[in-house]
């Protein structure tokens, strides 16, 4: 058993049918010695008397808020949560497996640049009685500080007969050095509590591996005289690291017809302009990627040919 926060304790339970459970001793936080009784949640049933209460925690029915009283007065509370292990594996019931980029991916993180700021998000089908707490550091044995805000509900989606909730959190490395080679990964730890269930989720990554630039900005077309060709120009996104001579991007320019089946013409360039043939009813799209490290491409920025 360990303390999650004041008066909230997590019992680690290795569960299987007929498991003996964990013996837990609760102590009433009071100088009183006599006439103390214990109850669980809203029930008035007296579970025991005395300054300590010994319970065998076998299942979620044994978790909850234990209260010690004397003469009708509440003396103290202890909330017991369960962290359940089955077949040697800690439960992952609260969050949804996003299966990207691989199975058992519960947390996904992205950074728009090398400033040490990143966003992580996760999915759940649970709508109520849910709290998250996020901690992060660079490295784990001698951790360097990363500050995370509060997790917030960032999107709701309906998928079939299921409602899905997306939560996200923003974190910032306290002493980030954008140009430095990373040797220790960022560690992100999310504590999730649903009702009486505690779970924790972790992710470990280098900023360079989670980079996803914003789309190029100010995408413009300039028709070339006496030609079906156009000059496409764009700029680096505002959120990308500077100077651009050091933090360089490469770009992919795509001409896509109205029909998805039509052949796509693609041009790759390190410049911020390109000359392409603009077909009728087609659109031109540009996306960006770090020039020197193959992390994610940005989303597309698009303009119609007409």
């Amino acid at each position: 058993i360990w303390e999650l926060k004041k008066d909230v304790y997590v019992v680690e339970l290795d569960w299987y049918p007929d498991a003996p459970g964990e013996m837990v001793v609760l102590t009433c936080d009071t100088p009183e010695e006599d006439g103390i009784t214990w109850t669980l949640d809203q029930s008035s049933e007296v579970l025991g008397s005395g300054k300590t209460l010994t319970i065998q925690v076998k299942e979620f029915g044994d978790a909850g808020q234990y209260t010690c009283h004397k003469g009708g007065e509440v003396l103290s509370h202890s909330l017991l949560l369960l962290h359940k292990k089955e077949d040697g594996i800690w439960s992952t019931d609260i969050l949804k497996d996003q299966k990207e980029p691989k199975n058992k991916t519960f947390l996904r993180c992205e950074a728009k640049n090398y400033s040490g700021r990143f966003t992580c998000w996760w999915l759940t089908t649970i709508s109520t009685d849910l709290t998250f707490s996020v901690k992060s550091s660079r490295g784990s044995s001698d951790p360097q500080g990363v500050t995370c805000g509060a997790a917030t509900l960032s999107a709701e989606r309906v998928r079939g007969d299921n409602k899905e909730y997306e939560y996200s959190v923003e974190c910032q490395e306290d002493s980030a050095c954008p140009a430095a080679e990373e040797s220790l990964p960022i560690e992100v730890m999310v504590d999730a509590v649903h009702k009486l269930k505690y779970e924790n989720y972790t992710s470990s990554f280098f900023i360079r591996d989670i980079i996803k630039p914003d789309p190029p900005k100010n995408l413009q077309l300039k028709p070339l005289k006496n030609s079906r060709q156009v000059e496409v120009s764009w700029e680096y996104p505002d959120t990308w690291s500077t100077p651009h001579s050091y933090f360089s991007l490469t770009f992919c320019v795509q001409v896509q017809g109205k029909s998805k089946r039509e052949k796509k013409d693609r041009v790759f360039t390190d410049k911020t302009s390109a000359t392409v043939i603009c077909r009728k009813n087609a659109s031109i799209s540009v996306r960006a990627q770090d020039r020197y490290y193959s992390s994610s491409w940005s989303e597309w920025a698009s303009v119609p040919c007409s």
Epitope: G61, T125, D161
Partner: nanobody, 123 residues
Framework: EVQLVESGGGLVQAGVSLRLSCAAS????????MGWFRQAPGREREFVAA????????YVSASVKGRFTISRDNAKNTMSLQMNNLKPEDTAVYVC????????????????WGQGTQVTVSS
């Protein structure tokens, strides 16, 4: 919202078998742990059995262990309770419930409840 409808109850002789079903609708069935409870006249509601969302783990009350088996079919949105070697003391209204805390024998940990199906076992 989740709607639960039990079926399969009836009047039977001691020693025979009965299979109860619980049909769920409303929200994704496979997101929920499920349980069976029973209530005999003049007695408190009693936990019978529970099953986790995938059906890989079950939790059965000591009073029915070895005689009752809980199972589920997520493709059909149904849960079943196979009751063998029934005894007169199994007479009760059997109610199914959904929750998100498996394993639990506590009513307070279940969120949605059916109306129940009557099982009467005569000697």
């Amino acid at each position: 919202e989740v709607q639960l409808v039990e079926s399969g109850g009836g009047l039977v002789q001691a020693g025979v078998s009965l299979r109860l079903s619980c049909a769920a609708s409303g929200r994704a069935f496979s997101n929920f742990d499920m349980g069976w409870f029973r209530q005999a006249p003049g007695r408190e509601r009693e936990f019978v059995a529970a099953i986790n969302r995938s059906g890989s783990s079950t939790y059965v009350s000591a009073s029915v262990k070895g005689r009752f088996t809980i199972s589920r079919d997520n493709a059909k949105n149904t849960m079943s309770l196979q009751m063998n070697n029934l005894k007169p003391e199994d007479t009760a209204v059997y109610v199914c419930a959904t929750g998100l805390l498996f394993p639990s024998s506590a009513e307070r940990n279940y969120d949605y409840w059916g109306q129940g199906t009557q099982v009467t076992v005569s000697s």
